[in-house]
Amino acid sequence: LCQGSNYSTCASCPSCPDRWMKYGNHCYYFSVEEKDWNSSLEFCLARDSHLLVITDNQEMSLLQVFLSEAFCWIGLRNNSGWRWEDGSPLNFSRISSNSFVQTCGAINKNGLQASSCEVPLHWVCKKCPFADQALF
């Protein structure tokens, strides 16, 4: 039911694991701790998920309700242009950047911001719910 691509939509699936928030057809995990961008990505991958890839403005607006001024890592990187971890370009929102060394993307309640990938920030994972209730 929910297997397949990490990035596929996931219709009519069971509920999310403990500590993950269900919205629409996906589960979201908002971290308590902080990690650098690569370690945040690793954290998500180990739990059958990926760093948040936002599909449209509607999803972005909803998620921002749960965010504060503090920035969270998402699956967005500047690799010859801003791209999501699923390979798609960032085309529905602007990202503010102060420096060319800020090549990883973060989000807070006000929008998207480029940041140096080594900075420890909170992060957001996203995944499809699974039929069996694993902790992760």
Epitope: V32, E33, E34, D36, S39, E42, A46
Partner: antibody, heavy 120, light 107 residues
């Protein structure tokens, strides 16, 4: 209560391999990552990596890639670590550890340690 | 890799002393530092997590503080059972890394 029971001490020849185990009791095995940590006599701690028993996902410290291989056997709630091409540098106590809270990497529970001695 | 430096390998103390053990990260690790105590022949025991939170059952004479790159574990009223090695660990970046340890000894 939560317990991690490790296999006994090993004396092995240089160049050989060794497989040490960590059996989990008192919790749902697939709910908590198993981490492995190395401690050389009188020295600090070195994180080797972890395995997620739920899906087999591993994350290795680059320093131990090719040296350590982490596996799990869900049916017996046991995690194993195989160390290959052993040298005197691999002589150490090896611990398995879990955080018990799967969203943090603070190790609240540790095995008793397995001493591996590499000697001709 | 992030290097965690515990500059004092040994510290001499007396019962009743206030002891501060320091740990310095080679880059910003936020508040993701953990402290462990290890006695000879035993496995490490978790004392402090997230830089300043005492783990369940840890006596309140143990306190942790710091953020960014500088961290301290303080024992406010040193007891003989506190003679041990103390290690810091960062959780901000893989690989997870530990300090080399600080051994508390009696004067």
């Amino acid at each position: 209560q939560v317990q991690l029971q490790q296999s006994g001490a090993e004396l092995v020849r240089p160049g050989a391999s060794v497989k040490i185990s960590c059996k989990a009791f008192g919790y749902t095995f697939t709910n908590h990552f198993i981490n492995w940590v190395k401690q050389r006599p009188g020295q600090g701690l070195d994180w080797i990596g972890y395995i997620n028993p739920y899906n087999g996902y591993t994350n290795y410290n680059q320093k131990f890639k090719g040296k350590a291989t982490l596996t799990v056997d869900k049916s017996s709630s046991t995690a194993c670590m195989e160390l290959s091409s052993l040298t005197s540098e691999d002589s150490a106590v090896y611990y398995c550890a879990i955080s018990y809270d799967g969203y943090y990497e603070r190790f609240a529970y540790w095995g008793q340690g397995t001493l591996v001695t590499v000697s001709a | 890799d992030i290097v965690m430096t515990q500059s004092q390998k040994f510290m001499s103390t007396s019962v009743g002393d206030r002891v501060s053990i320091t740990c310095k990260a080679s880059q910003n690790v936020g508040s993701t530092v953990v402290w462990y105590q290890q006695k000879p022949g035993q496995s490490p025991k978790l004392l402090i997590y997230s830089a300043s939170n005492r783990y369940t059952g840890v006596p309140d004479r143990f306190t942790g503080n710091g953020s960014g790159t500088d961290f301290t574990l303080t024992i406010s009223n040193m007891q003989s059972e506190d003679l041990a090695d103390y290690f810091c660990q960062q959780c901000s970046s893989y690989p997870l890394t530990f300090g080399a340890g600080t051994k508390l000894e009696l004067k």
